[in-house]
Structure formats: structure tokens, C-alpha cells
């Protein structure tokens, strides 16, 4: 069976949506009313890895579009990116790990944690208007915490 | 002995909010995924929403989105429906289940609240 | 949205008879598929979940298959008890939708 996919739109802690800046890029930014329609929404695939009560393993893929958020190594930094794959191929059960983030949900508190690279979070800015990131560092000025709001497909 | 138990269910007039509560027992509510679904009178099963264990996850269809809000008080063992603006159309019987998004299906339901939704 | 449509909408069966309920989904659900029962005024009851699996507590008599788009409830010998409307549901993607149900009844 193909790998199960659910289609979902993400908001930081602070209420701020993700956004396309580019053709390979996120920002995070407050919208309102009709500017919403602007916001991402992810196909969340459910993939194979380490799975418990709290933790779940997930691609997270664009809508629609061939491209998948991944971790990689750049100038020896941990990155997060927008990575092309062959729609043919993807999604699958068993992503590569560059693909893979622990949802992981204790406390009202939603986070992302590449499989790649563990304790380094999908992570927003406090500032409007800035790119979406991987960061090492939870509970200091970059926010960690996400809601996740399931849209029907 | 696992249970859930709805309260809140009664005669409204359209327009006009509502709001139900479920109260769990016999299981670690905090741990599991919860939601509502409606039956209609002498219809079928619509699951109007959903949240996830800790809160930070939520879904609605179509027909609720906008007007309904899903929480839940894991401090109390409680889960929660607002629901405002109603229609003739959301008077049915709500029930309160375990389960949601991810595991997909409804393994403990409680027994139900009627709302009437009439002028 | 996947549409699931169960047959037949209702049926009766003499205690002892083999029963089969059906459920036909509009696309594939990959056996993301769940049977419920519900006795006149309660609650559904959740019997298989995944297609085939039995869930905690529901009698041996109770089993489902099928895969792809055609799914089946079948109660090897039926009991008084088993007088319920039974519904099935997928979830293979949102919204997870429900069938309209079948009705049985003993003759």
C-alpha cells in the first residue's frame, strides 16, 4: 500500500503562518482573513521510524508540488531546505532520513525534530517576514512550538 | 472501567451557541487523540472534529469549520465542543469518542447529548 | 471526498444464518476501512479496525475482508444480540467518511 498522506497547515506558537518566499524557501509571517489562502499546506506522510505515544515520524512534503522539506548538512551546519524529488517516487514508507521529522506533541506543544540530526527543530524567527529554518536550540528566542490545523483533501 | 460521558446537549434556537463537554474516565486521557461525532435524527455517522492528545493538533470538515471549536482540559479529563452559530441542520445526537486523526477509527464512545437546533 | 456505500441498506436473517454486509468506497482505501455496530439507542461499538482486525472484546463470529475498493462484514452464525445497524468507515484520507449503514433484523 502507498504511504498514507494528510494534508495540514502549520502556525508557530506566536500565530504566525508559513508562506512560499521563492521558489525554495518558507517565511513566517502573520495573515489574516483572505491573505490565509496564502499559507502552505503540507501533505504530512506517515513514515517508517521510531514511533511512540508522543512521537511520530513524518515527511512533510508541499501540496501538490514535488517538493519536500529536508535536512542537510551545509558549511558543516545542520540546514533545512526545500529539496525537488521525482513525483514517481515520492512520498514513500520509507523516506530517506533527510526527509523524516519526529513530530513529536507533549503539553499542547507541537514540534519537529529532524531524524537526521536530533535535537535540531524546524524553527521560525521571532521577527516578521523571516525564513524558516533548522535550529539547535529550544526554549530561547526562536520559536520550536507549532499547531497543526488538518484540512480535508 | 473506560468511560465517557457527554453533557451539555439541549434545545437552542438557530444562531445561537452551545457547548458540550465530555468527562473521561478508566483511561490516561491525556494519552489519546479525541473527537465528536454527530448522528442525525435516524441518519447516519459524521465525525464534526477532532484534537489531538496534547491539544496542539485539530481538524474539522467542511460543513462545522468556522463555527465549531474543539478543545480539551487535560488537567480535568474533559473535552470540549463550542459551537456557535448553529443551524437547523447541526441538531442531532453528539458523541463524544476516543480515537482521531491518526489511528483513524473510534474504540470508546460515550453514550451521547442531544441538541435541537429549532426556533 | 471518498464515498462509502454499504449493501445492502437493510436485511433480515434467521438466527444461525450466515450474514455478509458490504462496503464499496469510491476509491482505493488501501484497507484503511473500520466496521462499527450499534444497537437501537447506544453508542456505536467498534468491532474491526484495518479491514480484518477484531478489536478487544467482539465474539470470533464477527470478521471482515476485502482490499482495494470492496469490503465485507460477514457474522459466521448470527445471534439475537447482533440486531443492530452497522456502519462502516474509512481512513485513508480526510475527511473520514462513514456509510450510510445497513439495518439488521431477524426474521
Known amino acids: 500500500a502507498p504511504v498514507r498522506s494528510l494534508n495540514c497547515t502549520l502556525r508557530d506558537s506566536q500565530q504566525k503562518s508559513l508562506v512560499m518566499s521563492g521558489p525554495y524557501e518558507l517565511k513566517a509571517l502573520h495573515l489574516q482573513g483572505q491573505d490565509m489562502e496564502q499559507q502552505v499546506v503540507f501533505s504530512m506522510s506517515f513514515v517508517q521510524g521510531e514511533e511512540s505515544n508522543d512521537k511520530i515520524p513524518v515527511a512533510l512534503g508541499l501540496k501538490e508540488k514535488n517538493l519536500y522539506l529536508s535536512c542537510v548538512l551545509k558549511d558543516d551546519k545542520p540546514t533545512l531546505q526545500l529539496e525537488s524529488v521525482d513525483p514517481k517516487n515520492y512520498p514513500k514508507k520509507k523516506m530517506e532520513k533527510r526527509f523524516v521529522f519526529n513530530k513529536i506533541e507533549i503539553n499542547n506543544k507541537l514540534e519537529f525534530e529532524s531524524a537526521q540530526f536530533p535535537n535540531w527543530y524546524i524553527s521560525t524567527s521571532q521577527a516578521e517576514n523571516m525564513p524558516v529554518f533548522l535550529g539547535g536550540t529550544k526554549g530561547g528566542q526562536d520559536i520550536t512550538d507549532f499547531t497543526m490545523q488538518f484540512v480535508s483533501s | 472501567e473506560v468511560q465517557l460521558v457527554e453533557s451539555g446537549g439541549g434545545v437552542v434556537q438557530p444562531g445561537r451557541s452551545l457547548r458540550l463537554s465530555c468527562s473521561s474516565s478508566?483511561?490516561?486521557?491525556?494519552?489519546?487523540?479525541m473527537s465528536w461525532v454527530r448522528q442525525a435524527p435516524g441518519k447516519g455517522l459524521e465525525w464534526v472534529a477532532y484534537i489531538s492528545h496534547g491539544g496542539a493538533g485539530t481538524y474539522y470538515p467542511d460543513t462545522v469549520k468556522g463555527r465549531f471549536t474543539i478543545s480539551r482540559d487535560n488537567s480535568k479529563n474533559t473535552l470540549f465542543l463550542q459551537m456557535d452559530s448553529l443551524r437547523a441542520e447541526d441538531t442531532a445526537v453528539y458523541y463524544c469518542?476516543?480515537?482521531?486523526?491518526?489511528?483513524?477509527?473510534?474504540?470508546?464512545w460515550g453514550q451521547g447529548t442531544p441538541v435541537t437546533v429549532s426556533s | 471526498d471518498i464515498q462509502m456505500t454499504q449493501s445492502p441498506s437493510s436485511l433480515s436473517a434467521s438466527v444461525g444464518d450466515r450474514v455478509t454486509i458490504t462496503c464499496r468506497a469510491s476509491?482505493?482505501?488501501?484497507?484503511?476501512l473500520t466496521w462499527y455496530q450499534q444497537t437501537p439507542g447506544k453508542a456505536p461499538k467498534l468491532l474491526i479496525y484495518n479491514a480484518k482486525i477484531l478489536a478487544d472484546g467482539v465474539p470470533s463470529r464477527f470478521s471482515g475482508s476485502g482490499s482495494g475498493t470492496d469490503y465485507t462484514l460477514t457474522i459466521s452464525s448470527l445471534q439475537p444480540e447482533d440486531i443492530a445497524t452497522y456502519y462502516c468507515q474509512h481512513f485513508w484520507m480526510l475527511p473520514y467518511t462513514f456509510g450510510q449503514g445497513t439495518k439488521l433484523q431477524i426474521t
Open positions: 469518542a476516543r480515537g482521531g486523526v491518526y489511528k483513524g477509527y473510534f474504540d470508546v
Open positions: 476509491g482505493n482505501i488501501y484497507d484503511y
Open positions: 478508566g483511561f490516561i486521557f491525556s494519552r489519546y487523540d
